[in-house]
């Protein structure tokens, strides 16, 4: 039988034999022989039949050196089997054994759950010699016990290479419930069921769980741990916690917020980072995600022009990074831009709209009717053209770029000239005689260089030739005009 020591307020007197019934104490200490100092509470024995030999782990009877008589078997005396006490209390327990004086160098070690207790543990061994035997008491004390002190403690003694093992002393440290699993914060869809889990352990068991929602208990009667709370659905945010009860009191879990997923808030702070003739780079600050991750965003672009049809261009993009380059825009145009983002619930409202403008574009057409001829001095080539019909969005004409390429006997050389916007003719110096000169002209605005005209070729003869006939860009067409003199 296991004697159970339990917490009890009154002290027990010294008692030479088995104590009746069970005992609960918070200051348990076991003793069978006089102690060196101080008050010593009672020794608690397992109730065994008097005179009955102990048949546990014993040392085999031995013959003395004289061979005259058998020694009795060596065994630890019975002691309390089970000590129950509250956390943070002190406990002291011991094991005792009487060893014939013929044995030398006896040592007692303490073991917990199969592992030897070494080092800082508070263990004391006391020896009480007599004529024939020495009584040995090994005491083990723990101050301010914790749950980690729970376990089975035994004494071991080595004599002549044999091991004697005591009965186990089970220490059970009781306290408030300890959570092994607490509810977790969640984001849930409105009116959709979800589960929360709570688990706590003693000792003492059982541990019972009450659920609390927004400071109100959900269940009138507790559930044994572990408990799963099924919430049928919420329409607004709620805070849940669980309370774990045992016979020592109750412990409250952390409160967890259960959020209701909603559409996101609109993005804020839409900013323009860079504008070109046909694109605008924007960024935005995402709004609150509505407790559900953003999936993607939509950039909405409206042209601000009384003559435009007011249609909205929509560009879909990923939610991250919070940046998008809007392309395929017209040059020198005003746009109103807004951003909206979505999560699994739906789209946010559109951000505050911002105004942005594209810059001037480059001309979209080349100068017309390009004509090239060699002047009388034969030192210059005259070039003439007509101003291109550029759109307003291309911006103001600032000039022309003339490309002339000289090819002679396997050598090719390109030169570029810039002329002002008021010109419609130019003169370039002959670079090489007995060579072909290919001329192309492009209009230039602040927005950039437009397309070059189709090439016009003229042959520059060696000195002494007399032809001044012009070469010109033919009327619309892609032929490669060349003038051979």
């Amino acid at each position: 039988a296991i004697t159970e020591a339990r917490e009890e307020a009154k002290p027990y007197p010294l008692f030479p034999g088995p104590l009746p019934g069970s005992l609960q104490t918070d200051h348990t200490s076991l003793l069978s022989l006089p102690h060196t100092s101080g008050y010593q509470p009672a020794l608690m024995f397992s109730p065994t039949q008097p005179g009955r030999p102990y048949t546990g782990n014993v040392a085999i009877p031995r013959v003395t050196s004289a061979g005259s008589k058998l020694l009795p078997p060596l065994a630890f005396k019975h002691t309390v089997g089970h000590i129950i006490l509250s956390e943070h209390k002190d406990v002291k327990f011991n094991c005792s054994i009487s060893v014939p004086n013929i044995y030398q160098d006896t040592t007692i070690s303490w073991w917990k759950d199969g592992k030897e207790l070494l080092g800082a543990h508070h263990a004391i061994t006391q020896f009480y010699p007599d004529d024939e035997v020495t009584a040995i008491i090994a005491s083990f004390s723990i101050t301010s016990v914790q749950r980690s002190d729970n376990g089975s403690y035994i004494c071991k003694m080595k004599i002549n290479n044999e091991e004697i093992v005591s009965d186990p002393i089970y220490i059970e440290v009781q306290g408030l419930p300890h959570f092994t699993k607490q509810p977790e914060s969640m984001n849930v869809t409105r009116n959709t069921a979800f589960n929360l889990t709570c688990q706590a352990v003693g000792p003492p068991e059982p541990v019972n769980i009450f659920w609390v929602q927004n400071s109100s208990r959900v269940n009138e009667q507790p559930e044994k741990s572990p408990s799963v709370l099924t919430v049928p659905g919420l329409t607004e945010m709620a805070v849940f916690s669980c309370e774990a009860h045992n016979d020592k009191g109750l412990t409250v879990s952390k409160g967890v917020q259960i959020n209701i997923k909603a559409i996101p808030s609109p993005p804020t702070e839409v900013s323009i980072h860079n504008s070109t003739a046909h694109s605008i780079l924007i960024s935005w600050v995402p709004g609150f995600d509505g407790y559900s991750p953003f999936r993607n965003c939509s950039v909405q672009v409206k042209e601000v022009d009384p003559l435009s049809n007011g249609s909205v261009m929509i560009f879909n993009t990923s939610a991250s990074p919070h940046m998008y380059q809007i392309k395929q825009l017209q040059a020198l145009a005003n746009y109103s831009i807004g951003v909206s983002c979505m999560n699994e619930i739906g789209w946010s409202a559109v951000s505050p709209w911002i105004l942005a403008s594209t810059t001037e574009g480059a001309p979209s057409v080349a100068p017309l009717n390009v004509t090239v001829f060699l002047n009388e001095s034969r030192d210059n080539v005259d070039i003439r053209w007509m101003k291109p019909l550029t759109k307003r969005q291309a911006g103001e004409l600032v000039g022309y770029r003339i490309s002339h390429v000289w090819q002679s006997a396997g050598i090719s050389k390109e030169l570029l000239e810039e002329v002002g916007q008021n010109n419609s003719r130019a003169q370039i110096s002959v670079q090489v005689h007995n060579a072909t000169c290919t001329v192309r002209i492009a209009a230039v605005t602040k927005g950039g260089v437009g397309p070059f005209s189709d090439p016009v070729k003229i042959f520059i003869p060696a000195h002494g030739w007399v032809d001044h006939a012009p070469s010109s860009t033919p009327a619309p067409g892609n032929a490669d005009p060349v003038l051979i003199i």
Epitope: N208, R217, Q221, E243, H245, D247, L250, V252
Partner: antibody, heavy 114, light 110 residues
Framework: QVTLKESGPVLVKPTETLTLTCTVS????????ISWIRQPPGKALEWLAV???????DYNSALKSRLTISKDTSKSQVVLTMTNMDPVDTATYYC????????WGQGTTVTVSS | QTVVTQEPSFSVSPGGTVTLTCRSS?????????ANWVQQTPGQAPRGLIG???SRAPGIPDRFSGSILGNKAALTITGAQADDESDYYC?????????FGGGTKLTVLG
Amino acid sequence: QVTLKESGPVLVKPTETLTLTCTVSGISLSSFAISWIRQPPGKALEWLAVIWTGGGTDYNSALKSRLTISKDTSKSQVVLTMTNMDPVDTATYYCASHWYLDVWGQGTTVTVSS
Amino acid sequence: QTVVTQEPSFSVSPGGTVTLTCRSSTGAVSTSNYANWVQQTPGQAPRGLIGGANSRAPGIPDRFSGSILGNKAALTITGAQADDESDYYCALWFSNHWVFGGGTKLTVLG
């Protein structure tokens, strides 16, 4: 729904022993600790004893020598005995859930008189 | 012997807010005293309002809330109604026993 119902004698004589029974329904006594509380006429509530889920007990220290609380989990009953009754023990006796004093019986009124 | 003290009486106007308190003779009230608040109308059994970790009993409206204010347990009733007129008892747990206060008689004026 958890309900508690007290039963016992309406009248006891001085020096006699009072035995009260609390019958619990809707829950097992292995998961509910039960306390006994009394209220003399026109006075405040007074806690008497608790029996824990594991069977352990605690008592009002001023009345401990006269009180015994026990339970029969299979019958879902908690029994309180109070010895050496005196007229000052005249009161309504309630049983209630322990950590939350929020499930109460309707009470049983006991008069101590010769 | 620990004594738990409550205000003997208190009055509140309909719709008003009132805070009843509960003091321990042994020092500050803490969460480990598991302050319970019980409402009792004359001739009726008590009804638990707040218990454990200041959580409301099932069915108790959120006009009732429990807390620890300074070194005392407190019961706050917001939006007081005529049927809140009752006796209110607090109970504190001291390691192995409950101690009830003497009760507060709450009157709702008008």
